[in-house]
Each structure stands twice: as C-alpha cells, then as structure tokens.
C-alpha cells in the first residue's frame, strides 16, 4: 500500500525518497514516474537521474535535496488538483530485480479560502492620521497612531461613535465590510 502525502493547491508538494550510496558520489540511477511502479522502469517519467546528475525532467519537478548523498526526494512546484495520484520512486540498483520501488500517494487539497481578517491590518495602516471629531463639547483632535491592538469589534464600535466624523467616511470609502449605522 502507498504512503500518503498531502499538499494544498498552489503549494509545493514533497515526496520523500532516499537511498545510501555505496560510496560518496557512487550514485545509482533513479527515476520518478506518475503512476504506480511497473515491473521495470517508471511509467510516465517526470524526472530521471543517472550516475552523475539529473539527466531528464519535466516542468515543475525538482530534486531539491542533496541527491549526491542519496536524497532523491521529489518536489513538485505549485501543485494543482491534477497533480493528485500515485508517484513511483524507483532506485535502479544494478543486478536483476534488485530495484527498490516506492509508491507514494499524493493528495492535493483545494487551497483554504481565508476570510479577510487582513482588512483589519489594512485599516490599521490606513489611518495613522489626525482627525477632528464633532462632539458635544469643543472640537477635539485625536491621534489614532497605528492602532496596533484594535480588533474589528472595536473598529465597528469606534465607527458607530464617530458616525458623523471623517473617520466614518474613510471607513466606508475603504471598502471594508463594516456596517456603520
């Protein structure tokens, strides 16, 4: 059975595969293919090494470890849902039927859709200005600074309190999802 590995759409996927060279630099050919390991070779080869270097690859498939020390783990750059499936790492040890074969299952999940709490930070950056509020007493100038610890509830409360002020207009103009009034 295959070992399962997961990645999100848009991330890099990592599929580990290792061997120990008999001597430093005494490398063994390796192939990576899409689909379970067949009896010989790799089907749908995406990357191949020889005794010296990577000698074949297709786009987005990388050996990113120290392959000279036997780290032939595959990195797939910027994955899509179509990258899901079984991958074969085949270490082609000389001799009849000596190959080491590893089937690895890659499961790609849709990217998490994060709601926009970053809006809050946008606010913070957007209002380091001075503003004058109209209140019951004399005009009062307040400095908002960069509002480092303010949260959306506080902003909403603040916006309600300052409904008539320029801040309220600024909040509205910023496109943020805060109901005022």
């Amino acid at each position: 059975s295959e070992v399962e590995y997961r990645a999100e759409v848009g991330q890099n996927a990592y599929l580990p595969c290792f061997y120990t060279p008999a001597a430093p630099g005494n490398l063994v050919p390796v192939c990576w293919g899409k689909g379970a390991c067949p009896v010989f070779e790799c089907g749908n080869v995406v990357l191949r090494t020889d005794e010296r270097d990577v000698n074949y690859w297709t786009s987005r498939y990388w050996l990113n470890g120290d392959f000279r020390k036997g780290d032939v783990s595959l990195t797939i750059e910027n994955v899509t849902l179509a990258d899901s499936g079984i991958y074969c790492c085949r270490i082609q040890i000389p001799g009849i039927m000596n190959d080491e074969k590893f089937n690895l299952k890659l499961v790609i999940k849709p990217a998490k859709v994060t709601p926009a709490p970053t809006r809050q930070r946008d606010f913070t950056a957007a209002f380091p200005r001075m503003l004058t509020t109209r209140g019951h007493g004399p005009a009062e100038t307040q400095t908002l600074g960069s509002l480092p610890d303010i949260n959306l509830t506080q902003i909403s409360t603040l916006a309600n309190e300052l409904r008539d002020s320029r801040l309220a207009n600024d909040l509205r103009d910023s496109g943020a999802t805060i109901r005022i009034g």
Partner: nanobody
Framework: QVQLQESGGGLVQAGGSLRLSCAAS????????MGWFRQAPGKEREFVAS????????SYADSVKGRFTVSRDNAKNTVYLQMNSLKPEDTAVYYC??????????????????????WGQGTQVTVSS
C-alpha cells in the same frame, strides 16, 4: 550586456543580520535561476543558495540552512539574500550569479560554480565576534 551588482554587505556583530541585494540587467531576469556564492580569504568559492525562476524552489548549503533565506522580485530584476544569526565563519565576499541554462523549469538547482555563467563583483560581509 549582462550585469549583476551586489549591495548590502558590511560589518556586523555575530548574531546580527544583513540583507544582500543583487540588481540584474542585460537579460530576461525572470527566465534564469539565480544563485549566491561566497569566498572567504584563502578558500574556494562555495555555494550558498539558489532560487528558481518563479521563486518557488530554493536550495541552500547545509552551513546556512535555517539562517539564510533567498528570494527574488522579478518585477524589480533583483535577487535577495537575507542573512540572520550571522557567525564569524560567514565572513566572506558574497557573489550573485546567473544560471547557464535559459528557463530551467525543473530538475535540480545548480549548486556548483560551473553551473553559472555570469557573476557580480561581490560585496564584503564581515562578521565580528
């Protein structure tokens, strides 16, 4: 013609940070892997880090893993090397280099000087203890 200009080097205390920049011109920057190397006095030039065309794949020498971060901005034709937790043994001239291969889309990021065609003049980084 191809030009690579490093900047951002200097003298820093052990444990400190520096950010090196390499401004590139004279070629289609976004179509080449870029690398950083360094050379200490009396030593051979050694690989530090490299980054794929899109910036999605990076590779590091064991000696800098977890401390250095390579990045690139293709809109600004610039590659960066953020160096944190610097050690005296990081003292060297740091060079930016451009890959030999046009639009390397996969395989392996080159970590040998022979894999790079063009080099900057270098910027000195000195880490004092």
């Amino acid at each position: 013609q191809v030009q690579l200009q490093e900047s951002g080097g200097g003298l820093v205390q052990a444990g400190g940070s520096l950010r090196l920049s390499c401004a590139a011109s004279g070629f289609t920057f976004g179509s080449y892997v870029m690398g950083w190397f360094r050379q200490a006095p009396g030593k051979e030039r050694e690989f530090v880090a490299s980054i794929s065309t899109s910036g999605g794949i990076t590779s590091y020498a064991d000696s800098v893993k977890g401390r250095f971060t390579v990045s690139r901005d293709n809109a600004k034709n610039t590659v960066y090397l953020q160096m944190n937790s610097l050690k005296p043994e990081d003292t060297a001239v740091y060079y930016c280099a451009r890959d030999l291969t046009y639009y390397r889309t996969g395989g392996r990021l080159p970590d040998n000087a022979n894999g790079y065609a063009y080099w900057g003049q270098g910027t000195q980084v000195t880490v004092s203890s």
